[in-house]
């Protein structure tokens, strides 16, 4: 659980301000597994990397939160970062 959370935080902290903004916008429409809801837009847009990590983990649990984060990174063209995140999660 701690490893996945740290991996998410590490990935989000490596995004530029512009990329973090784009990440949040893509997170609002990313396809979700059945049974999961969306983080409310209002809360999401003002969050920094640390708050967003905590919200992802509390909303989706650490494992799915990491998978979802990786998918949004891939949607942004950041496949290498996504791969590193998933590798760190599965160590």
């Amino acid at each position: 659980m701690g490893r996945a959370r740290d991996a998410i935080l590490d990935a989000l902290e490596n995004l530029t301000a512009e990329e973090l903004k784009k990440f949040k916008l893509k997170l609002l429409s990313v396809p979700l597994r059945e049974g999961y809801g969306r983080i409310p837009r209002g809360a999401l847009l003002s969050m920094d990397a640390l708050d967003l990590t905590d919200k992802l983990v509390s909303f989706y649990a650490a494992t799915y939160g990491a998978e979802l984060t990786a998918n949004v990174l891939r949607d942004m063209g950041l496949q290498e970062m996504a791969g590193q995140l998933q590798a760190a999660t599965h160590q």
Epitope: S29, G77, E80
Partner: antibody
Framework: QVQLQQPGTELVKPGASVKLSCRAS?????????????LEWIGNINLSNGRTNYN??FRAMATLTVDKSSSTAYTQLSSLTSEDSAVYYC?????????????WGQGTSVTVSS | NIVMTQYPKSMSLSIGERVTLRCKAS??????VSWYQQKPEQSPKLLIY???NRYTGVPDRFTGSGSATDFILTITSVQAEDLADYHC?????????FGAGTKLELK
């Protein structure tokens, strides 16, 4: 419909270089297609921040750059051989999810011949 | 690198037939597969992305399915304008890779 503008043809000598251009936006990919063959991804560049990714196969011969002021992506192909005679496409990823290549230029046909 | 294997290499068919094109990834790529149509002397055109999402303006006779390593493009009733090369590609990992293509020809 977004139109990606690419010049039509380039004739270059073996060992020489060529710089291909593409008016584009967002992530711009470069894709090689030899006559009668499949598609090969060379690399991509993000026009807003200059971030690049390369296919290792092409890293030594392709250099991707961008001119933000004109929204133009470039690939410089160097030390060309006959194997590099191909159509080179630029393509954009504009769909919000799954990172497909949804807009393609008409391609630049590069012929390497003495 | 992820290898995308397409089969068959070519298919001869009659107008109105149902066609199934297959693409197999050498490792799990989730749903990060797209299908492209390419007619002679033209650029590729996006048909399907995210394995099953039809791109804007693509006729509903084109359907994509599959996930992980096995993907299918189905054309329910082939029209003359569908005779072309079809490429699958993955965007899960760099380098992005494509299959060798399947050519649809008239019988």
């Amino acid at each position: 419909q977004v139109q990606l503008q690419q010049p039509g043809t380039e004739l270059v000598k073996p060992g020489a270089s060529v710089k291909l251009s593409c008016r584009a936006s967002g992530w711009t990919h470069w894709v090689k297609q030899r006559p009668g063959q499949g598609l090969e991804w060379i690399g991509n560049i993000n026009l807003s921040n200059g971030r690049t990714n390369y296919n290792e196969k092409f890293r030594a011969m392709a250099t991707l750059t961008v001119d933000k002021s004109s929204s133009t992506a470039y690939t410089q192909l160097s030390s060309l051989t006959s194997e590099d005679s191909a159509v080179y496409y630029c393509a954009n990823s504009m769909v919000p999810h799954f990172f497909p290549m949804d807009y393609w230029g008409q391609g630049t046909s590069v012929t390497v011949s003495s | 690198n992820i290898v995308m294997t397409q089969y068959p290499k070519s298919m001869s068919l009659s107008i109105g037939e149902r066609v199934t094109l297959r693409c197999k990834a050498s490792e799990n790529v989730g749903s990060y597969v797209s299908w492209y149509q390419q007619k002679p002397e033209q650029s590729p055109k996006l048909l399907i992305y995210g394995a099953s999402n039809r791109y804007t303006g693509v006729p509903d006779r084109f359907t994509g399915s599959g996930s992980a390593t096995d993907f299918i493009l189905t054309i329910t009733s082939v029209q003359a304008e569908d005779l072309a090369d079809y490429h699958c590609g993955q965007s899960y990992n760099y380098p992005l890779t494509f299959g060798a293509g399947t050519k649809l020809e008239l019988k």
